[in-house]
């Protein structure tokens, strides 16, 4: 019985699940395919975070291809999420900051953060892994940035956000990679690990864009995505070199990925995701 085939997953602070685009294919590069037609199509550009036009050859390619700008926006952006939610001049919090914390109807044990309107602070809670509501953040910093007031009573300065398709939580875009860095490597380095659909258990590595490291995962032997490497070295070669550090005068310098300490230390517990 395949009930017994499920693996226990342990996630610790060194291996957080990658943050997701609304759909992982939104991170794929525009692919015109091998054919020679000239067809106007649209794709989502993860660097500009906008839907853009490209010429499609008429066959093959990938799922990051849409007939219309509207369809692309619908699949890869969310108007209610991609807008800048607030600036230091706006005191309103999004409505979902006032929702009660909701663990959802499932029972994985995942540490998340919610804004407690009684204490006016972001606090930790155990999320079950499905459903719940939008007052649900992967990090304390995200929660603070979106829902807490700054020291002068204004909102914390913020940036564009993206709806996490998983649990409808708003995920600031700049948490996809640390804010000190821009990513200029292959787009698939930002996609989550994908086991694929088969039954094998092959040792592979994927690039975890949240922590900036290559991590092992079990590949099923078919399907999945391109964030899949047979060795850690191959993974690092392909993905780690894509990070470029910004320096204050706007210039860009190549860097080995040393991370500035985050403003907020995120105290992740070991999370046992029960039979997920």
């Amino acid at each position: 019985d395949s009930e017994e085939d499920e693996e226990h997953t342990i996630i610790t602070d060194t291996e957080l699940p990658p943050l997701k685009l609304m759909h992982s294919f939104c991170a794929f590069k525009a692919d015109d395919g091998p054919c020679k037609a000239i067809m106007k199509r649209f794709f989502f550009n993860i660097f500009t975070r906008q839907c853009e036009e490209f010429i499609y050859g008429g066959c093959e390619g990938n799922q990051n291809r849409f007939e219309s700008l509207e369809e692309c926006k619908k699949m890869c952006t969310r108007d209610n999420a991609n807008r800048i939610i607030k600036t230091t001049l706006q005191q309103e919090k999004p409505d979902f900051c006032f929702l009660e914390e909701d663990p959802g109807i499932c029972r994985g044990y995942i540490t998340r953060y919610f804004y407690n309107n009684q204490t006016k602070q972001c606090e930790r809670f155990k999320y079950g892994g499905c459903l719940g509501n939008m007052n649900n953040f992967e990090t304390l910093e995200e929660c603070k940035n979106i829902c807490e007031d700054g020291p002068n009573g204004f909102q914390v300065d913020n940036y564009g956000t993206q709806l996490n398709a998983v649990n409808n939580s708003l995920t600031p875009q700049s948490t996809k990679v640390p804010s000190l860095f821009e990513f200029h490597g292959p787009s698939w380095c930002l996609t989550p690990a994908d086991r694929g659909l088969c039954r094998a258990n092959e040792n592979r590595f994927y690039y975890n864009s949240v922590i900036g490291k290559c991590r092992p995962f079990k590949y099923s032997g078919c399907g999945g995505n391109e964030n899949n490497f047979t060795s850690k070295q191959e993974c690092l070669r392909a993905c780690k070199k894509g990070f470029i550090q910004r320096i204050s005068k706007g210039g860009l310098i190549k860097t080995k990925r040393k991370r500035k300490k985050q403003r907020v230390k995120i105290a992740y517990e070991e999370i046992f995701v029960k039979n997920m």
């Epitope: 499920e6 699940p17 759909h23 663990p103 109807i105 499905c130 994908d194 039979n275 997920m276």
Partner: antibody
């Protein structure tokens, strides 16, 4: 073995309140590894989820927007059951109503269902 | 709401032959941990629905291994490797990625 036993009238007049009860055996309505739901089925609308309640650190509920203004699902811990109340019913609410258990721990699905109650809304 | 679309709506089958049902969701049902927020149910004639497959591909307790679920993103498939007479009924897919929980319109499997 979890069993869900439904009870309640099969005929309700328009504008009145539909009330059904689901008695649980083999599990507890207060279990933190389950959630308790009502789902209805009609030829026109297929299977339609109405709402769910669950106990974790406290009681939570979620309702379908289509019935949110009219629905209440309540637990009764003393009798180990939960109930559905749907106010201001119309003939559109005629359906087979099922209570179901959502397995929260491993299966993440409706793994036990009541026998179903055909409720007809008619004067 | 997430719309679940099943095809075909009716599937005449021959005992011993394979059968396949498709379910498409209007948005992706895959979580970061690789969990697929999709279940399959079978409602036999005159009975309540029963859980067949949970999290996209895991058979529920007591479900024969001729049933298998697969798929990811927005496209999912339920396969029966060799149909038996007792497999007749209506098959439903159901998502729990977001509220409201929604079901497909059902695929009626009947013996030819």
């Amino acid at each position: 073995q979890v069993q869900l036993q439904q009870s309640g009238p099969g005929l309700v007049k328009p504008s009145q309140t539909l009330s059904l009860t689901c008695a649980i055996s083999g599990d507890s309505v207060s279990s933190n590894s389950a959630a308790w739901s009502w789902i209805r089925q009609s030829p026109g609308r297929g299977l339609e989820w109405l709402g769910i309640i669950y106990k974790r650190s406290k009681w939570y509920n979620q309702y379908a927007v289509s019935v949110k203004s009219r629905i209440t699902i309540n637990p009764d811990t003393s009798k180990n059951q939960f109930s559905l109340q749907l106010n201001s019913v119309t003939p559109e609410d005629t359906a087979v109503y099922y209570c179901a258990r959502w397995h929260s721990d491993k299966m993440w699905g409706f793994d036990d269902w009541g026998q179903g109650t055909l409720v007809t809304v008619s004067s | 709401d997430i719309v679940m679309t099943q095809s075909p709506l009716s599937l005449p089958v021959t005992p011993g032959e394979p059968a396949s049902i498709s379910c498409r969701s209007s948005q992706s049902l895959v979580f970061s941990f690789g969990i697929t927020y999709l279940n399959w149910y079978l409602q036999k004639p005159g009975q309540s629905p029963q859980l067949l497959i949970y999290k996209g591909s895991n058979r529920a307790s007591g479900v024969p291994d001729r049933f298998s679920g697969s798929g990811s993103g927005t496209d999912f498939t339920l396969k029966i490797s060799r149909v038996e007479a007792e497999d007749v009924g209506v098959y439903y897919c159901q998502q729990y990625d977001s509220y409201p929980l929604t079901f497909g319109q059902g695929t009626k499997v009947e013996i030819k």
